[in-house]
């Protein structure tokens, strides 16, 4: 399980995965734009098993999933996506 926590750089992701995660295992996805002391965009997947995974924003699967979600943004999203900056 990949750990997610605050570091001195205020980035939350220490390690990132590029492995595909089926949607039925996902509770929600959090997108943290770069800024506030973290020089990179971060994507955090909160899973139904209560574990948390940082996903490489360059991973093909997450880019494809985000594109699908963007296309469906006018209707209810099957996977809640939260975009916010770290306070």
């Amino acid at each position: 399980v990949l750990e997610v926590y605050y570091t001195s750089l205020r980035c939350r992701c220490v390690q990132e995965s590029s492995v595909f995660i089926p949607r039925r295992f996902i509770d929600r996805i959090q997108i943290l734009p770069r800024g506030n002391g973290c020089p990179r965009k971060e994507i955090i997947v909160w899973k139904k098993n209560k574990s948390i995974v940082c996903v490489d924003p360059q991973a093909e699967w997450i880019q494809r999933m985000m594109e699908v979600l963007r296309k469906r943004s006018s209707s209810t999203l099957p996977v809640p996506v939260f975009k916010r900056k770290i306070p």
Epitope: P22, R24, S51, W61
Partner: antibody, heavy 120, light 107 residues
């Protein structure tokens, strides 16, 4: 060492019922999704059903959901498949498999299977 | 349901050959594809997950690629112990579905 051992297979008449069991050892059974997959003689693999640890997410192959019921007992490290109204086409080797939902998200450990024969 | 069409259904190759198996999904499955190896009378073994990731202990001659609807499984240099049937499977959504299998034989 991870071990999944299926049991409960055998010969049953059409219309009959059977309950398969899968005993798990060497894994923290209560943390993982589990699946049943079957294979008819000389044929390919067919997914049957899956269940999550809390038993609140259960999915079936559409053609089987009216007759088959997947369940589990985390205290006994056991997975079950209740099969009712059995038909000749249900004859197969039935495998249980652990479905990793931590870092691979695939069926990474399989039992050796138990054979179900439906015949009069 | 998502159909997984695997080809060829059987193939014969020589030791040292490069072997390629393809799998086509009936709809986009992102990179949610695994490849399994099954030897007669045995349970399937996971080789590749997430389309291209080798499972622990799997030799480097096995590889996978693809995304969306088209996937490829390759054995770079066939070994005698690779004789088996290989299956692709999509785990993008339920019901999980398998390809029909490719039976690999030695020439």
């Amino acid at each position: 060492e991870v071990q999944l051992v299926e049991s409960g297979g055998g010969l049953v008449q059409p219309g009959g019922s059977l309950r398969l069991s899968c005993a798990a050892s060497g894994i923290d059974f209560s943390r993982y999704w589990m699946s049943w997959v079957r294979q008819a003689p000389g044929k390919g693999l067919e997914w049957v059903a899956e269940i999550n640890p809390e038993r609140n997410y259960i999915n079936y192959a559409p053609s089987l959901k009216d007759r088959f019921t997947i369940s589990r007992d985390n205290a006994k490290n056991s997975l079950y498949l209740q099969m009712n109204s059995l038909r000749a086409e249900d004859t197969a080797v039935y495998y249980c498999a652990r479905q990793d939902d931590y870092d691979k998200y695939a069926m990474d450990y399989w039992g050796q299977g138990t054979t179900v024969t439906v015949s009069s | 349901d998502i159909q997984m069409t695997q080809s060829p259904s059987s193939l014969s190759a020589s030791v040292g050959d490069r072997v390629t198996i393809t799998c086509k999904a009936s709809q986009d499955v992102n990179t949610g594809v695994t490849w399994y190896q099954q030897k007669p009378g045995k349970a399937p073994k996971l080789l590749i997950y997430s389309a291209s990731y080798r499972y622990t202990g799997v030799p480097s001659r096995f590889s996978g690629s693809g995304s969306g609807t088209d996937f490829t499984f390759t054995i770079s240099s066939l070994q005698p112990e690779d004789i088996a049937t290989y299956y692709c499977q999509q785990y993008y959504s339920t019901p999980l579905t398998f390809g029909g299998g490719t039976k690999l034989e030695i020439k």
